[in-house]
Interface confidence: medium
């Protein structure tokens, strides 16, 4: 077979090849941010030529292009300034409002690199409508200047660009628009992935009984569905396996619906999930009808079995038989459960489609979107049981419109994406879903977004005080209880005087609360060993308190998960009949286990546990610690077996204020608490009055940093004891 | 006041060694590690490696290893540093150096001139 | 090793004139929260003197007219209205691991 010509670089470009030179190869383009390719791509033909998709000549010189964005075309009771023709990357535009009209959004927004304005649409609202005025993104116009309940605004995109979001949008009841905010963007614009990750996390964690994080305090504004851990998702994930997609990038698209796969999983929602790849035909490889459907490791490996080979004698891209293969199952489920029944109508249904390209064959994907809709009976009040995510990848020859109407429209929320590259996607993936939300007692969730609060990533941090001495800290490892260490209180046992103070959504400064009781291990003496030359000693430095109230749940306030826990076995998900040595294993795993505590500032801090030898050669710089341990004779004697051993390499230390706090580890997206900061031989933040300010030992330090955390796992039986009624314990 | 005088000039041939003292006063000598830095006439400044004087443990710049040593007296509160197969290209003030607790360099001796010539 | 490179090599400021001096480093300087990146003035026949340590604090002593900003890879070291005695070499040094590395020095003279 012919190979297509070599002579096709991009000045200022570099270009790669899904199949080398050989016919069905396509040829993609790329430039530096800030420049888009012209073309975007082109396919060797079977005739040993390339063809540039939409073009008219069949071979025009590819140039990277300066990426502009689009100017305003109108704007109302107002002005915006500059007033340009398209602005260019890092160009600002400013908008200010006419008298007796207030600014709602972005005042001054900036050309970014992929395309696209940053910040939200400027508009001059005076309040007047039973809706708020909706607007004109930029590039955009509108007809339709009545806000009324009922009425009824249009948009369209000026010159070549396109419209994605709600060419049409209607003015609700409840003061809120219909669809979702249409935007302008130029065809060969992107979206970042940090802009999609909390767009498309926003979205899908509403599904998963969650509210949306940037939602305004009216009630009534966005949607607001619990999926109760009771009710049931059926997720599908549709993967385009065309010619178009390389081996390599269908690797990526497969990586990143796993991510997706332990993401949905870790939110112990009741999901099934389908698993469909398409080219020219649809292969299902998991069905929502299939038990395995609901069994996390099934659906992983049934991912991993996904052939890039199983699609090669048909390699077009046939995106209506795929969305309807969807919709054969549906059927089949519905006819299963019964139309009228609960059980089929409770399912929520969430289709996420990675695709490269447009369907260029099969009919319009559309027609197997309204046969979903319709068997799914999805209307105003319906409209929560269905979502469909439509995310293009790779800016080539993914068609705006095409993915926009296949998404859903939902107002504050959006469904079509376009992502530069495969490897973007893999970014979304990774930080999308954030079950930190929900409201009941599941453990260990953490916000892990980039633009969340310290309480927000560690819910279960809370902070003692008792009487006015110095405060130390702990972990909610229920709604009522918290653990810590003993040593916080060895002034006696009144606790009327102690405050724990737990996160709260409402008050950066947190809620109090009294104690109801508190539980101080007995075997706790610092000065037990006094008469061996051991001047403090913190075997069993382990407490817990009972808070006076119940901690209302919040994304600011949850347990960790304790190991040995059925609590945290599902979490980890391990099967049934697993034991608290399993636990051990599985997470106290490695000479060297990276663990985190939370710093006086809030922020999590790292550091390694040592385990085996490692934690022998760790606590053995204890004996050069001359003043605490004047005659020691053998480590043991002060740094037992109940304690885990951190200080070495670039650990942090823990601070004196820091005591009781949790040593954590993350696994699966969740946490797990292994040990509480007792004590050591460094205090980093000894003479700072500052909270952000602690520095690590000095060189000439002798001995170097340790600290000693106490195991949960060698306190089984005390935290048995205590709360048994409170957890469910595993056998050890 | 923290105060850290070093002994006189050397001249030395090459192939010979070099011992430069720095005593130490105004403070608890064995709390701080002593550094030794170099600067040859018209260059820049060149760190040799330092001391922890309580437990004598030393960090070497590997340019030095093997020819430089760090010594420490704590009974008179003193730090040493011998250089020995010198070389003209070792023409250079020799300077030691107390860290902080931030390990910078905040107080510094007056430097000895040691010389490299045949 | 973490080298270090300060620009420019010299440079000539008028009397009450700002001088900005920078210092680019090989590898990441940060740990446990801090830059430890530290500022020193030299004058000729005179040791160093430590100006600023740990990127951005000003040593007890040291006019407030010097200052230090930066973090990770890329510091400066400000002189916010020169006076006739701020005429010097300046060394930035690290020391967030071993070897300790300066850089190459900026000298300053007034124009």
């Known amino acids: 077979a012919p190979s297509c010509p070599q002579n096709v670089n991009i000045s200022g470009g570099t270009f790669t090849l899904s199949h080398g030179w050989a016919p069905g190869s396509l040829l993609t383009y790329s430039c530096p941010q800030g420049l888009y390719p012209s073309p975007a791509s082109r396919l060797c033909k079977s005739s040993g030529q390339w063809q540039t998709p939409g073009a008219t000549r069949s071979l025009s010189k590819a140039v990277c292009k300066p990426v502009r964005c689009p100017a305003p075309v109108s704007f109302e009771n107002g002005i915006y300034t500059p007033r340009l023709g398209s602005y260019p990357v890092g160009g600002n535009v400013s908008f200010e409002c006419e008298d007796g009209f207030i600014l709602r959004g972005s005042p001054v927004r900036q050309c970014r690199p992929n395309g696209m304005w940053d910040g939200e649409t400027a508009v001059c609202d005076n309040g007047a409508g039973h809706c708020p005025n909706p607007g004109i993104s930029l590039g955009a116009v509108r007809t339709g200047f009545r806000f009324g309940h009922g009425d009824k605004v249009r948009y369209r995109c000026s010159s070549n660009l396109v419209l994605t979001g709600s060419s049409e949008r209607e003015c609700q009841g409840n003061g809120v628009w219909s669809g979702t905010e249409p935007i302008c963007r130029q065809p060969y614009s992107y979206d970042f992935p940090e802009d999609v990750a909390p767009a498309l996390g926003t979205s899908f964690s509403h599904m998963l009984g969650a509210t949306n994080p940037t939602q305004k305090t009216k009630e009534s504004l966005g949607r607001k569905i619990q999926i109760q851990r009771s009710g049931h998702l059926n997720l599908y994930l549709l993967l385009d396996c065309s010619q178009s997609v390389s081996e390599n990038d269908f690797l990526i698209f497969k990586e990143s619906a796993s991510l997706m796969v332990d993401r949905i999983f870790s939110f112990e929602i009741n999901v099934s999930v389908a698993i469909i790849t398409f080219a020219s035909e649809p292969k299902v490889l998991m069905s929502v009808l299939n038990d395995n459907s609901r069994d996390m490791t099934e659906v992983i490996s049934s991912l991993e079995n996904a052939n890039y080979k199983d699609h090669e004698n048909g390699t077009g891209t046939n995106t209506y038989a795929a969305l309807n293969s969807v919709y054969l199952m549906m059927n089949n489920q519905m006819r299963l459960l019964g139309m009228e029944t609960m059980a089929w109508q409770e399912i929520r249904h969430a289709i996420i489609l990675l695709t490269d390209g447009k369907s260029n064959m099969g009919g319009s994907p559309k027609t197997a979107v309204d046969h979903i809709r319709e068997i799914l009976n999805i209307n105003q009040k319906r409209n929560d049981y269905l979502d469909i995510y439509a995310i293009g990848v790779g800016k080539l020859d993914v068609d705006w419109r095409e993915l926009n109407e296949l998404g859903s429209k939902k107002d504050g929320e959006r469904h079509a994406f376009i992502l530069q590259d495969t490897k973007a996607l893999h970014q979304v993936f990774e930080h999308m879903l954030d079950v930190s939300k929900l409201t009941d007692t599941i453990c260990g969730v953490g916000n892990m977004s980039a633009n969340a609060s310290d309480q927000e990533r560690t819910p279960w941090h809370v902070t003692i005080k008792p009487k006015s001495q110095e405060t130390c800290r702990g972990a909610l490892i229920s709604d009522q209880w918290v653990l810590t260490a003993a040593h916080c209180f060895r002034d006696g046992n009144d606790h009327s005087l102690w405050r724990v103070n737990v996160g709260d959504p409402k008050s950066q400064w947190g809620k109090e609360f009294l104690i109801e009781k508190a539980v101080i291990s007995p075997g706790f003496d610092v000065f037990a060993k006094k008469n061996q030359g051991i001047l403090e000693f913190y075997g069993d430095d382990i407490a817990l308190l009972k808070l006076a109230q119940k901690v209302k749940m919040s994304t600011h306030a949850r347990p960790i998960c304790l190991p040995c826990t059925m609590e945290a076995n599902l979490a980890l998900r391990r099967p049934q009949g697993s034991t608290c040595r399993d636990h051990e294993n599985e997470l106290l795993n490695k000479q060297s286990v990276p663990a985190h505590f939370v710093a006086l500032n809030g922020s999590k801090l790292n550091i390694n546990l040592k385990m085996g030898v490692e934690w022998t050669s760790c606590a053995e710089v204890v004996s050069q610690e001359k003043t605490m341990f004047p005659n020691l004779t053998d480590v043991r004697e002060v740094v037992t077996d109940q304690f885990l051993c951190s200080g070495t390499q670039e650990d942090e230390s823990p601070c004196k204020g820091e005591s009781g706090g949790a040593v954590f580890l993350e696994r699966r997206f969740r946490f797990f608490q292994v040990g509480l900061v007792s004590w050591g031989l460094y205090n980093p933040c000894l003479g700072s009055a500052d909270k952000n300010s602690r520095k690590r030992a000095p060189r000439s330090k002798v001995p170097p940093p340790r600290d000693f955390h106490i195991n949960l796992f060698r306190m089984q039986p005390w935290l048995r004891q205590h709360l048994g009624d409170v957890l469910n314990f595993l056998p050890l | 006041e923290v105060q850290l005088v070093q002994s006189g000039a050397e001249v030395k041939k090459p192939g010979a060694s070099v011992k430069v003292s720095c005593k130490a006063s105004g403070y608890t000598f064995t709390d701080y590690n002593m550094d030794w830095v170099r600067q040859a006439t018209g260059q820049g400044l060149e760190w040799i490696g330092d001391i922890n004087p309580n437990y004598e443990s030393t960090g070497y710049n590997q340019k030095f290893k093997g020819r430089a040593t760090m010594t420490v007296n704590k009974s008179i509160s003193t730090a040493y540093m011998e250089l020995s197969s010198l070389r003209s290209e070792d023409t250079a003030v020799y300077y030691c150096?107390?860290?902080?607790?931030?390990?910078?360099?905040?107080?510094w001796g007056q430097g000895t001139l040691v010389t490299v010539s045949s | 090793d973490n080298v270090l490179t300060q620009s420019p090599d010299s440079l000539a400021v008028s009397l009450g004139e700002r001088a900005t001096i920078s210092c680019r480093a090989s590898k990441s300087v940060r740990t446990s929260g801090y830059n430890y990146m530290h500022w020193y003035q030299q004058k000729p026949g005179q040791p160093p003197k430590l100006l600023i340590y740990?990127?951005?604090n000003l040593k007890s002593g040291v006019p407030d007219r010097f200052s230090g900003s930066g973090s990770g890879t890329d510091f400066t070291l400000t002189i916010s209205s020169l006076q006739a005695e701020d005429a010097a070499t300046y060394y930035c040094?690290?020391?967030?691991?071993?070897?300790?590395?300066f850089g190459q020095g900026t000298k300053l003279e007034i124009k």
């Open positions: 040094q690290h020391s967030r691991e071993l070897p300790y590395t």
């Open positions: 740990l990127a951005s």
């Open positions: 150096a107390r860290e902080d607790d931030h390990d910078a360099f905040a107080y």
